[in-house]
């Protein structure tokens, strides 16, 4: 045996996105012949060693992230890819909406805003029919995204969900559904691009913008964040309302 | 309540052989994973061994891989190391640990230990 | 040699307040998993003092605590007794060949 066994693959379906008691099964998937399996879920010290968890209600202490290996003889594999459990309506769903609004013309410009009451700092945005169904949705870090020079590929339904990053796999529900319009000559839908992780502070009112610029298929985002305060919001989760006015590079 | 008693220790010649016994009472034994760790005179605490509930998940430090074997039988309450090829540095307390459990969870460590069985390899 | 690193010994008067560290790597506890401190006092077995980083087992007294932060860990004992004069070992898990690790204890001294 030269090198490590290749990593397994890990997944939940249907989806990687379960709301509160619904079911959810993990999945592990090696080479055929695996002597035994180990799945882990991490930052908890606790593992089952079987290829499949079917979990039957989505509970908030399962939410997390897991892991698996396998082990043929004495060797073990490489760890999978890491899976985000994620429990969603854990909170009140935000209200997702476009400016101007949910009709707009090819080469355009819109802005889709995801709004919370709560003291979230965390947002995102999922677009039906991403090709990738088991994936989770786009999550967008920062406040401010509006979507320049609109395609007809931004056509379609999207949905946001909040979050703070204090427990970034607890889950708002998702928002109504926003049907975004694009006239113009017709295009493959497209996913949304990936924006990586940057902390954000927390607030208790607040609005996720998306902006993304398509140049050759190839996207940019400009980010701001722009915050009120609302002193009278108690149930915030996050804590304590503060103000705040942040703006990305 | 939960106990675990560990015997079979003596003074054995270096590449001799040794059988460890551990017997298990207050608790579901077959559900849960047990493991053997050691601990040489003024060291500190090396794991050695581990085994799944049903037995056939088995794993084992580098330094004793292919010398000892772990095994149990749960019809008895009872867990054993088979030590083969004994060295000098095997000479250690040897203890058995049991690992704690939840539900359909094991967890990654060890909530119940024995008292200790001391073995001698010196020739 | 040890894969997690502790210090061999610590000391302190009754009363004080002494951390015993633990150093791993990315891929033990850096790697998701939990750290466990165990004490063993003189002529006995280990007993399991603090679970999943942080947590106490029934029965253990609130001044022992524990933290975990990125590859490390730390054990912290408030208002030493002479009792708590004991060797003391951290343990967690290894990605790699998945096997358990422990530190190579902390001797703790009550002076």
């Known amino acids: 045996q030269s090198g490590p066994l290749p990593k397994p693959s890990l997944q939940a379906l249907p989806s990687s996105l379960v709301p509160l008691e619904k079911p959810v099964t993990l999945r592990c998937q090696g080479p055929p012949g695996v002597d035994l399996y180990r799945l882990e879920k991490l930052s908890s010290s606790r593992y089952q060693d079987q290829a499949v968890l079917f979990i039957p209600a989505m509970k908030r202490s399962l939410a997390g992230r897991y892991r698996c290996s396998y082990q043929n003889g004495s060797l073990w594999s490489l760890p999978s890819d890491q899976l985000e459990l994620v429990a969603t309506g854990v909170f009140a769903k935000p209200s997702l909406s476009a400016q101007p609004g949910p009709a707009v013309s090819s080469g355009g410009d819109v802005t889709l805003q995801c709004q919370t009451r709560y003291g979230f700092d965390q947002f995102a945005l999922y677009k039906e029919g991403d090709p990738a169904p088991y994936k989770n949705p786009e999550r967008w870090y920062r406040a401010s995204f509006p979507i320049i020079t609109v395609t007809a590929a931004h056509s379609g339904t999207y949905r946001c969900y909040s979050f703070s990053s204090r427990d970034p796999y607890l889950w708002s529900a998702p928002s109504d559904p926003l049907e975004l319009v694009v006239t113009g000559t017709s295009v493959t839908p497209s996913r949304l691009p990936t924006e990586p992780p940057s902390p954000v502070a927390e607030f208790s009112e607040a609005t996720a913008e998306l902006t993304v610029s398509f140049t050759n298929e190839v996207f940019t985002t400009e980010t701001s964040r722009s915050i009120t305060a609302s002193p009278k919001e108690s149930d915030s989760p996050a804590g304590p309302a503060r103000q705040y006015y942040t703006k990305g590079n | 309540q939960v106990q675990l008693v560990e015997s079979g220790g003596g003074l054995v010649k270096p590449g001799g052989s040794l059988r460890l016994s551990c017997a298990a009472s207050g608790f579901s034994f077959g559900d849960y994973y047990v493991s053997w760790i050691r601990q040489a005179p003024g060291k500190g605490l090396e794991w050695v061994s581990a085994i799944g509930g049903s037995g056939s998940a088995v794993q084992y430090a580098e330094s004793v891989k292919g010398r000892f074997t772990i095994s149990r039988d749960n019809a008895k309450n009872s867990l054993y190391l088979q030590m083969n090829s004994l060295r000098a540095e095997d000479t250690a307390v040897y203890y058995c640990a049991r690992h704690y459990r939840e539900f359909r969870w094991h967890y990654y460590y060890f909530d119940y230990w024995g008292q200790g069985t001391l073995v001698t390899v010196s020739s | 040699q040890s894969v997690l690193t502790q210090p061999p010994s610590v000391s302190g008067a009754p009363g004080q307040r002494v951390t015993i560290s633990c150093t791993g790597s990315?891929?033990?506890?850096?790697?998701?998993?939990?750290v466990h401190w165990y004490q063993q006092l003189p002529g006995t077995a280990p007993k399991l003092l603090i679970y999943g980083n942080s947590n106490r087992p029934s029965g253990v007294p609130d001044r022992f605590s524990g933290s975990k932060s990125g590859t490390s860990a730390s054990l912290a004992i408030t208002g030493l007794q002479a009792e708590d004069e004991a060797d003391y070992y951290c343990q967690s898990h290894d990605l790699g060949a998945h096997v358990w690790v422990f530190g190579g204890g902390t001797k703790l001294t009550v002076l």
């Open positions: 990315s891929s033990n506890i850096g790697a998701g998993y939990d």
